[in-house]
């Protein structure tokens, strides 16, 4: 693994893709989504230590300034680098429609 | 302002653009950048309460699951929605070069 992918905090502690099983009720969708009834939500969770999966120059700057001024500048944050699309069967005024969302499930993660 | 831009925690507490004055030394750039000697670094700082500047559907899901399972799912995070380019005058083996970085300064912010 590249240096940027090796977690210094121990396995599974750094920014990574994580799956959470959620119902329509959990997601607050029960009133407008018919299907799926449950979703395997993939999201980005974990710490962003120095040089770990830094997304860009901005992330490097932020980490350097966080080390200097931790009370002012937060550490970089683990967020999606890209998404997987997902289709939802939605209730409409007249029935149902199928809508594909491109920004619903995280595909991979980085630190920004 | 849209509901998504009104901070329920009070002025300046929610996700917003923030400027930090930094020297080349602060940034760890002194050995490879000649100019500028100081940078007004714009970055995204602040809390992401429910419905505040949600970037996409993923952010909505994350907030709903955070409220349900705060120990497992973190709240959305304040990150750049876009960047302003910046030119750096860099030292090279033979002299200097001008390099434009597109991902260095945050332009505006949202919650993901």
């Amino acid at each position: 693994a590249r240096n940027g992918d090796r977690c210094p905090l121990g396995p599974g502690r750094c920014c990574r893709l994580h799956t959470v099983h959620a119902s329509l009720e959990d997601l607050g969708w029960a009133d407008w989504v018919l299907s799926p009834r449950e979703v395997q939500v993939t999201m980005c969770i974990g710490a962003c230590p120095s040089q770990f999966r830094e997304a860009n120059m901005h992330a490097q700057i932020k980490m350097n300034l966080h080390r200097l001024k931790p009370d002012t500048v937060p550490a970089p944050c683990c967020v999606p680098a890209s998404y997987n699309p997902m289709v939802l069967i939605q209730k409409t005024d007249t029935g149902v429609s199928l809508q594909t969302y491109d920004d619903l499930l995280a595909k991979d993660c980085h630190c920004v | 302002a849209r509901n998504g831009d009104r901070c329920p925690l009070g002025p300046g507490r929610c996700c917003r653009l923030h400027t930090v004055h930094a020297s080349l030394e602060d940034l760890g750039w002194a050995d490879w950048v000649l100019s500028p000697r100081e940078v007004q670094v714009t970055m995204c700082i602040g809390a992401c309460p429910s419905q505040f500047r949600e970037a996409n559907m993923h952010a909505q899901i994350k907030m709903n699951l955070h409220r349900l399972k705060p120990d497992t799912v973190p709240a959305p995070c304040c990150v750049p929605a876009s960047y302003n380019p910046m030119v750096l005058i860099q030292k090279t083996d033979t002299g200097v070069s001008l390099q434009t970085y597109d991902d260095l300064l945050a332009k505006d912010c949202h919650c993901v």
Epitope: S35, P36, N84, M86, V87, L98, L104 | -
Partner: antibody, heavy 118, light 107 residues
């Protein structure tokens, strides 16, 4: 615009293997929730669901035919395939593929006619 | 397998009338029922999802109802283009099964 089109050999002899192709456009099998089903229709048995395949390669078969069916996909070329081994006259039918979104089959192809003849 | 029974193979109606096509499941399938329309020489077209929800583009004269074991597709103000065979289908459990179909004839 969602379209699906089935293709196959038209006619085979008993005991041969039927290979069907469903070529589709207007959606992607990389999208969570998307799948493709195969259904056949004959005058004797009406509409009969055969199999489906999901975006994540989850496959389901009709138990009455499971030992003879194989469904597969080529995501990059937007195609789904169905193989039926050891065909006999009872397999004479029109074969349809349909788009599946979770549990909804909302678009069907035009169908391809297949006959088993000795 | 869950048997879906459409007792009436044929129904005759006139333009402007209201007609109800029924479908009975041998066991409880909740609302996991779809309805399809198949015009002569064409492939099936999806009309109704989850027993009562019309797909977008389906005229509002088509209405689905029912839950458990008894389901109905009602066509109000029948039009000549509604001449077709109508099938119910359960997707509550594998294998998915279809009703035998009801052919609607226009007088």
């Amino acid at each position: 615009q969602v379209t699906l089109k089935e293709s196959g050999p038209g006619i085979l002899q008993p005991s041969q293997t039927l290979s069907l192709t469903c070529s589709f456009s207007g959606f992607s099998l990389t999208t969570s929730g998307m799948g493709v089903d195969w259904i056949r229709q004959s005058s004797g048995k009406g509409l009969e669901w055969l199999a489906h395949i999901y975006w994540d390669d989850d496959k389901r078969y009709n138990p009455s035919l499971k030992s003879r069916l194989t469904i597969s996909k080529d995501t990059s070329s937007n195609q789904v395939f169905l193989k039926i081994t050891s065909v006999d006259t009872a397999d004479t039918a029109t074969y349809y593929c349909a788009r599946r979104a979770w549990d909804a089959m909302d678009y069907w192809g035009q169908g391809t006619s297949f006959t088993v003849s000795s | 397998d869950i048997v879906m029974t459409q007792a009436q193979k044929f129904m005759s109606t006139s333009v402007g009338d209201r007609v109800s096509v029924t479908c009975k499941a041998r066991q409880n399938v909740g609302t996991n029922v779809a309805w399809y329309q198949q015009k002569p020489g064409q492939s099936p077209k999806a009309l109704i999802y989850s027993a009562s929800y019309r797909y977008s583009g389906v005229p509002d004269r088509f209405t689905g109802s029912g839950s458990g074991t008894d389901f109905t597709l009602t066509i109000s103000n029948v039009q000549s283009e509604d001449l077709a065979e109508y099938f119910c289908q359960q997707y509550n459990s594998y294998p998915y099964t279809f009703g035998g179909g009801t052919k609607l004839e226009i007088k």
